[in-house]
């Protein structure tokens, strides 16, 4: 990735240098070093400050975004004197030609689409490409499928996420000939992307006074146990007047998922649907399919 | 219902091994992940280890590394923990449980605890 | 010595309203990790009372609440009953010991 780095030194410089692919910033050792700190500013002045690395030379910034662009500083005190460098890192190219819209969702347990647009001011021939890292950094991830409107990339389709970790960094890079794109980056918790499948293997058995539905927890991306699960269960009448409210009932996940409901012979024919959300960002996946139960003469 | 059924109590010699085993009925062993916990009237709860699924492994805790093994069969949904070279401060209950949540690990359910005495 | 610290214990009348702390760190709750808490009547397995810091199992009646702020977490019990005279465990992840840390348990008297 190419990017206009530019250090502000003092006459004696510590040639701080920063690698995007690792995120690691490192500078020059000084003997003697009583003192080492470094830490970026972002543009609305937030401050990161991540630990030195064991050498006390290099640190490595975790979560961090770059596109809005950030200025690294490195504070070096040795027996003799004090060091400070600041290196500026801006998202070089034309403002306005970085990706736009971005957004990923897994989805079936373990595929993922991620969309974006053109920027706004870039021009025709621009391309773009997807880069993805885990929060381990061990692996790079390239788009292995893009998905593309009138011959630029404006998605990706992955059909293998054995690299992803629970927390994830998207990068975005662009290239023309003509002027230099800017790029845009992004963290992601797959938890907060991942849409579940409706719950599966939907029964329901009824006797002479109650109806028991059960249900087996959707499969998942996430490793999730069933502790992690809220489902919401749809039992309707059927032909019942428009606008009649169908019951809706909040069920906990619990190791045999299960709800049992009063219902007593003759029963009128009834549907029951499922859907299942991640308990703690309650994104619910789309409806089980119907399930009837009782007859119409009931 | 799901139920956690662990062997019976056990009376070791210092510097033996003692394994410990924990059927699980209502459910396939394959689709859960079991943890082990022991308690002492004097430290407490101590959690050992289980199966972590960032890692996809069974992990333990550092405290009992290199002294403890964790096992399942999942064919007769049953999981085992050995502990070796036993000493008097590891007499406690033992405790396997099913792991509800992978967000703060809560318990749920229990075994009924199998008590392990050390003693010369 | 728990990681979590707890009170050894507490005490009152029948339908009062009791509640315990749990005081953790800045690896555990304050990671933030999830709080559970447990009942361990004499002689039994512990009994989930509460998971995801406030959230209650099926089959847990609502006299039993909790919450959690910072690095501590507590548990509400309203309406005190003499079957909740018992042992009370804090539970949380910790992020330096990679694994379960629990608190040194609180005995609930019911006077």
């Known amino acids: 990735e190419k990017s206009d780095l530019r250090t502000v030194a003092p006459a004696s410089s510590l040639n701080v240098r920063f690698d995007s692919r690792t995120m690691n910033l490192s500078w020059d050792c000084q003997e003697n070093t009583t003192f080492s700190k470094c830490f970026l500013t972002d543009k609305k002045n937030r401050v990161v400050e991540p630990r030195l690395s064991n050498n006390e030379c290099s640190c490595t910034f975790r979560e961090i975004c770059l596109h809005e662009g950030v200025t690294f500083e490195v504070h070096v005190n040795t027996s003799q004197r004090g060091f400070q460098q600041k290196l500026l890192y801006p998202n070089s190219g034309r403002e306005g030609t970085a990706a736009q819209n971005f957004s990923c969702f897994i989805y079936n347990a373990d595929l993922m689409n991620c969309t974006w647009a053109r920027g706004p001011t870039a021009p025709r021939d621009v391309q773009y490409f997807l880069y993805i890292r885990n929060s381990k950094r061990r692996r790079e991830i390239r788009c292995p499928y893009y998905i593309q409107d009138s011959g630029t990339h404006v998605g990706c389709h992955l059909d293998n996420l054995s690299g992803l970790t629970s927390r994830n960094y998207f990068l975005v890079n662009g290239t023309s000939r003509e002027i230099g794109i800017q790029f845009f980056d992004s963290l992601l918790d797959t938890k907060k992307i991942e849409r579940f499948n409706p719950p599966s293997n939907v029964t329901v058995r009824c006797n002479t006074t109650h109806c028991l539905v059960r249900w087996k927890q959707p499969r998942t991306y996430q490793k999730l146990s069933y502790l992690d699960f809220q489902y919401q269960l749809d039992v309707h009448r059927k032909n019942t007047q428009p606008g009649t409210e169908n019951l809706l009932i909040n069920v906990s996940g619990d190791l045999e998922n299960r709800y049992n409901f009063p219902s007593s012979e003759p029963r009128a024919k009834h549907s029951v649907k499922i859907r299942a959300a991640d308990v703690r960002i309650l994104n619910w996946s789309s409806w089980s399919e119907a399930i009837e139960f009782g007859s119409d003469d009931g | 219902q799901v139920q956690l059924v662990q062997s019976g109590a056990e009376v070791k010699k210092p510097g033996a091994s003692v394994k410990v085993s924990c059927k699980i009925s209502?459910?396939?062993?394959?689709?859960?992940?079991i943890h082990w916990v022991r308690q002492t009237p004097t430290k407490g709860f101590e959690w050992m280890g289980g199966?972590?699924?960032?890692?996809?492994?069974?992990v333990y805790a550092q405290r009992f590394q290199g002294r403890v093994t964790m096992t399942e069969d999942t064919s007769i949904d049953t999981a085992y923990l050995t502990l070796s070279s036993l000493r008097s401060d590891d007499t406690a209950v033992y405790y396997c449980?099913?792991?509800?949540?992978?967000?703060?690990?809560?318990?749920?359910?229990w075994g009924q605890g199998t008590m392990v005495t050390v003693s010369s | 010595q728990a990681v979590l610290t707890q009170p050894s214990s507490v005490s009152g009348a029948p339908g009062q309203r009791v509640t315990i702390s749990c005081t953790g760190s800045?690896?555990?709750?304050?990671?933030?990790?999830?709080v559970s808490w447990y009942q361990q009547l004499p002689g039994t397995a512990p009994k989930l009372l509460i998971y995801?810091?406030?959230k209650r199992p099926s089959g847990v009646p609502d006299r039993f609440s909790a919450s959690k702020s910072g690095t501590s977490a507590s548990l509400a019990i309203t309406g005190l009953q003499a079957d909740d005279e018992a042992d009370y465990y804090c539970?949380?992840?910790?992020?330096?010991?990679?694994?379960?840390?629990f608190g040194g348990g609180t005995k609930v008297t019911v006077l």
């Open positions: 449980a099913i792991v509800g949540s992978f967000s703060g690990y809560p318990y749920r359910p």
């Open positions: 209502g459910h396939s062993l394959s689709e859960l992940s």
């Open positions: 199966f972590d699924p960032e890692e996809n492994e069974i």
């Open positions: 800045g690896s555990n709750i304050g990671a933030p990790y999830d």
């Open positions: 995801h810091n406030n």
């Open positions: 539970q949380s992840y910790d992020s330096s010991l990679s694994g379960s840390v």
